[in-house]
């Protein structure tokens, strides 16, 4: 796969993943009422990171925000923080990667600068994806713990009426947002890895600039430091490079000059 394609695909995959992270963070269905083996309630409860909602049998849905910071579980706060950090890093990653894209020309930015930016954005996407995956996993773990705790005391005594009064223990299970978050985090991570791989292809080879052209009578022969390995192609750089009179310039360099195909 060419460097440009790898970089472009990495960017697109990261972008999709990033959009998914935002969607998951905003979604209300992080946890949904478990309907299996439960008293059948005429209401359906579900909760997000920012508010809890109830859908009645008529379809009427009412949501209430968590208007407190101190009263919320530390784990929920941690998940919120992880998701926000993931989004912030993703935004920075996108901005950096836009400038790093090989198909976009900005001033006289050389390939080494683009390579560094590509690597930076790749790392940002990787961390962003990891933040999302950790955040979602922490929430999922919290749900599993609470689920088994509430199953253990499905009905808790409420006193009154001779101690016979029962309260319905609403058990919660994984909501759609968790799956969106896991997939989105994974995509962002994969996209970041692709950007890092693309960075390697973008990095200019130092030997290209150390090459010297000698004009022998009758023919053009390129001599490179490194002896036999350089000419036989068994060295570290096995790609076929053309050497031109105008100095050492690779095929990749040739592409970096605007052609009529560069502007899409």
């Amino acid at each position: 796969m060419s460097v440009t394609a790898c970089q472009g695909l990495g960017f697109v995959v990261s972008l999709i993943g990033f959009a998914g992270i935002i969607a998951a963070t905003c979604m209300d269905q992080w946890s949904t009422q478990d309907l299996y083996n439960n008293p059948v309630t005429a209401v359906f409860n579900y909760q997000g990171l920012w508010r809890s909602c109830v859908r009645e049998s008529s379809g009427f849905t009412e949501c209430r925000g968590y208007f407190t910071l101190l009263g919320l579980p530390a784990m929920l706060q941690a998940v919120r923080a992880l998701m926000i950090v993931g989004i912030v890093l993703g935004v920075i990653g996108i901005l950096v990667s836009i400038f790093a894209l090989k198909c976009i020309r900005i001033g006289s930015m050389d390939d080494s600068a683009k390579a560094k930016m590509t690597l930076t954005s790749g790392i940002l996407f990787i961390i962003s994806g990891i933040c999302a995956i950790i955040g979602v996993s922490v929430f999922a773990n919290m749900l599993v713990t609470n689920f088994w705790m509430s199953t253990a005391n499905m009905y808790s005594g409420m006193g009154g009426m001779g101690g016979m009064v029962q309260t319905v223990q609403t058990r919660y299970t994984f909501g759609a947002a968790l799956f969106v978050g896991w997939v989105a985090g994974g995509l962002t991570l994969i996209g970041g890895v692709m950007m890092c791989i693309a960075c390697r292809g973008l990095t200019p080879d130092d030997s290209n600039f150390k090459a010297v052209s000698y004009h022998a009578s009758g023919q053009n022969v390129a001599y490179r430091p490194g002896g036999f390995k350089a000419s036989t192609g068994f060295g570290s750089n096995t790609r076929n490079k053309k050497i031109y009179d105008g100095g050492a310039r690779t095929e990749d360099d040739e592409q970096s000059h605007p052609t009529k195909y560069d502007y899409v």
Partner: antibody
Framework: VVQLVESGGDFVQPGGSRKLSCAVS????????MHWVRQAPEKGLEWVAY????????YYADTVKGRFTVSRDNPKNSLFLHMTSLRSEDTAMYYC????????????WGQGTPLTVSS | DIVMTQSPSSLTVTAGEKVTMSCKSS????????????LTWYQQKPGQPPKLLIY???TRESGVPDRFTGSGSGTGFTLTISSVQAEDLAFYYC?????????FGLGTKLELR
């Protein structure tokens, strides 16, 4: 004006079957869940069955489970209650009721259709 | 199933008097998700179908006079008529609308002295 008109109530022998109908008008029938509620002579109200707007959720009272079937025909604005293995204790006034938009309330009630199960 | 217990079974009052009737459920009807109680009150006059009075334990249905007030939470609920009128003579039923099967109380009969 919301209107619910029940029909089909009659004298039935124990063990017999009957199908009650409810013709609805004045609101978008397909958007609302519907209930059947009955009231035995000189007795209180007893909830019988519920069917959601899209028929995905159907619930019955334990006393009628396995004997009664609730259904609806949204294009025809009609609600049905098919009753089998009828018993004398099923004798009651049967009401067709709309499920309210708020609070799972039962907001509009028909006038009812009487069913008598007797030999 | 949730058992709804209404008391008293009948009340004899004079016009203008304040009336209170009780409804208790065997399980809590409070939903923590939206902080609401899923209890409904109905009024049934002789020869008529029931009429919705109050939902969410305390929210009056539109068109219901403000002399009718619902209160309570969890398992204990109350319907209060601040000043009874002749047209208020009827049966009053409370209903669990939280857990299926939805269950009614046996009712409270309001009579004029």
């Amino acid at each position: 004006v919301v209107q619910l008109v029940e029909s089909g109530g009659d004298f039935v022998q124990p063990g017999g079957s009957r199908k009650l109908s409810c013709a609805v008008s004045g609101f978008t029938f397909s958007s609302f869940g519907m209930h059947w509620v009955r009231q035995a002579p000189e007795k209180g109200l007893e909830w019988v069955a519920y069917i959601s707007s899209g028929t995905t959720n159907i619930y019955y009272a334990d006393t009628v489970k396995g004997r009664f079937t609730v259904s609806r025909d949204n294009p025809k604005n009609s609600l049905f209650l098919h009753m089998t293995s009828l018993r004398s204790e099923d004798t009651a006034m049967y009401y067709c009721v709309r499920s309210g938009y708020y609070g799972n309330s039962l907001d509009y009630w028909g006038q009812g259709t009487p069913l008598t199960v007797s030999s | 199933d949730i058992v709804m217990t209404q008391s008293p079974s009948s009340l004899t009052v004079t016009a203008g008097e304040k009336v209170t009737m009780s409804c208790k459920s065997s399980q809590s009807l409070f939903n923590s998700g939206n902080q609401r109680n899923y209890l409904t009150w109905y009024q049934q006059k002789p020869g008529q179908p029931p009429k919705l009075l109050i939902y969410w334990a305390s929210t009056r249905e539109s068109g219901v006079p403000d002399r009718f007030t619902g209160s309570g939470s969890g398992t204990g609920f109350t319907l209060t008529i601040s000043s009874v009128q002749a047209e208020d003579l009827a049966f009053y039923y409370c209903q669990n609308v939280y857990i299926y099967p939805l269950t009614f109380g046996l009712g409270t009969k309001l009579e004029l002295r």
